[in-house]
């Protein structure tokens, strides 16, 4: 064939707005506008059309769009023509999205959820991968089992605890303390037959620079578990925090630059400046992670005038602990995340 598509996820094809093969022209000059502008439904922007002629109600997410019927810029939408190449006449309004991700040599689209293995479910958000464990974390047995250890069982994905007794014969542990993930989720009455659950945020997917963390929550009308994401930046990659540790000290728990700054994402800049706190570093083998944090909403403005907002981790305080793994292993932290309820806030 004359065209060879690469073996990646195919772009969607828009529903036909009309037969564009016979009449591909959408803008007409001179402009022909109705005597009065249309009245738009609640929440739909009244904008100038793409021909820069008339007022129109902006097309919404999933609507067809053309050079004339443009997507709602106030909702961060753009016209995705990828289903109509090479004509680029009719597209579909899509969300302005960030960067795709590469994990273990595999490329994932922004927003795409995937399972790199049986233990984790991951999501690509603006260039960073965030994962949540699929194996329910059962606490190790206590008291009656002096030497618990986790072992892989053939045919099973998730490791299980076994108890090494005095006879050194491993046996499966009794099903005690098998209630939840490592960190306890918020449980409250939501509506009949629904117990609301929000998992803690997963660790940031990168040890420095922009990353993502995710959590599962069923606090919605359908009581259906959904994955939420937020951007995170534990510490800048381009600052050597080791040099800031005072003489005689082994750690710097929190690092805060003197100047305020704007966040940048996919070429877009935050609409206001911030003075964030970052987690520091230690001279020994300890690693510093947030233990008091919250989630803030950051609005971004793009060069073409479009805007969008993202949830972002805001660090208030960090602590340095001994449970450190390879910072480049995005799954390592998920194995042993500390049981601090503040992290989920």
């Amino acid at each position: 064939t004359a065209l060879s598509p690469a073996p990646t996820t195919m772009d969607f094809t828009p529903a036909p707005l009309e037969d564009t093969s016979s009449r591909p022209q959408f803008c007409k000059w001179p402009c022909e506008c109705p005597p009065s502008p249309p009245r738009c439904p609640l929440g739909v922007s009244l904008i100038t059309d793409g021909c820069e002629c008339c007022k129109m109600c902006a097309q919404q997410l999933g609507d067809n769009c053309t050079e004339a019927a443009i997507c709602d810029p106030h909702r961060g939408l753009y016209c995705d023509y990828s289903g109509d190449r090479p004509r680029y006449a009719i597209g579909v309004c899509a969300q302005v999205v960030g960067v795709g991700c590469v994990l273990d040599g595999v490329r994932y689209n922004n927003g795409q959820s995937f399972q790199p293995n049986c233990k984790y479910n991951c999501t690509c958000i603006d260039g960073a991968v965030g994962c949540t464990p699929l194996c329910l974390r059962v606490r190790p047995p206590r008291l009656w089992c002096p030497h618990p250890r986790r072992v892989s069982i053939p045919g099973h994905c998730c490791e299980q605890w076994v108890c090494e007794d005095d006879a050194k014969r491993p046996r499966k542990t009794a099903p005690r303390d098998t209630g939840a993930f490592d960190a306890v989720g918020e449980v409250e009455a939501w509506h009949r037959n629904c117990i609301a659950y929000t998992s803690p945020w997963s660790p940031c997917s990168t040890s420095c620079g922009l990353g993502v963390s995710t959590r599962i929550s069923n606090v919605n009308a359908q009581c259906w578990p959904e994955q939420e994401s937020r951007l995170c930046n534990l510490r800048p990659c381009d600052v050597d925090i080791h040099t800031l540790i005072k003489a005689g000290k082994k750690c710097l728990a929190v690092y805060q630059p003197e100047a305020s700054m704007n966040f940048t994402l996919a070429g877009c800049i935050s609409t206001r400046s911030y003075q964030p706190k970052y987690c520091g570093v230690c001279m020994d083998n300890r690693c510093c992670i947030p233990y008091k944090s919250k989630t803030i909403d950051v609005s971004f403005q793009c060069p073409d005038g479009l805007g969008f907002s993202r949830q972002v981790l805001w660090i208030n305080a960090c602590f340095c602990n001994l449970s450190c793994r390879n910072p480049n292993d995005i799954f390592a932290d998920l194995e042993s995340y500390p049981d601090f309820s503040e992290i989920a806030n």
Partner: antibody, heavy 117, light 107 residues
């Protein structure tokens, strides 16, 4: 103003590879496909392929299949075209252009690639 | 692949003249044709898309017509800055193909 700015001229030896960059400004890179064309000295325009910077999907003209790779780096609003196993016949000005309704607009200023031993 | 054939390959004309360039596709491309102007050492510039729609900022002396397989680009009154090479391009199907070009020279 919507603009595409390409990297500077390059001289390569036969058998080598060349990587040309194309940086977009004035719009969100992920909203449009980028196409690559080339023009040999005194010759017409030849289409090479496209890339969707949002999905990473690509499509190449059969002539270049296996020898061309188009990639994108959305955080820097840059698209790249790499052509390998160069011969003297690959000496040309290489252009990137944004896919628009029924045509290409705008175009980059062009990058002259000279293949000479 | 769709072949695009332009005629003439070159034309000489004077300022103020009306000039017509034709482009023929080897198969039906509906109205999916674009016209470009290219000056020496410069990148092509989109003049007309969808056979007859004038690109924003292009002078109205340029016009396009046709559908199916036969298309024309007309410059109603040549200006000094119009002397250049003109290309047609089909945007109906992949692979995208261009005409070989028409060089417009000063008489």
């Amino acid at each position: 103003e919507v603009q595409l700015v390409q990297s500077g001229a390059d001289v390569k030896k036969p058998g080598a590879s060349v990587k040309v960059s194309c940086q977009a400004s004035g719009y969100t890179l992920t909203s449009y496909d980028i196409h690559w064309m080339r023009q040999a000295p005194g010759q017409g325009l030849e289409w090479m392929g496209w890339i969707n910077p949002n999905s990473g999907n690509t499509g190449y003209a059969e002539k270049f299949q296996g020898r061309v790779a188009m990639t994108s780096h959305t955080s820097t609003s840059t698209v790249y075209m790499e052509l390998s196993r160069l011969t003297s016949e690959d000496t040309a000005v290489y252009y990137c252009a944004r896919g628009a309704m029924g045509g290409f607009d705008p175009w980059g200023q062009g990058t002259l690639v000279t293949v000479s031993s | 692949d769709i072949q695009m054939t332009q005629s003439p390959s070159s034309v000489s004309a004077s300022v103020g003249d009306r000039v017509t360039i034709t482009c023929r596709a080897s198969q039906d491309i509906s109205r999916w044709l674009a016209w470009y102007q290219q000056k020496p050492g410069k990148a092509p510039k989109l003049l007309i898309y969808a056979a007859s729609t004038l690109q924003s900022g292009v002078p109205s002396r340029f016009s396009g017509s046709g559908s199916g397989t036969d298309f024309t680009l007309t410059i109603s009154s040549l200006q000094p800055e119009d002397f250049a090479t003109y290309y047609c391009q089909q945007a109906n199907t992949f692979p995208i193909t261009f005409g070989q070009g028409t060089r417009l020279e000063i008489k």
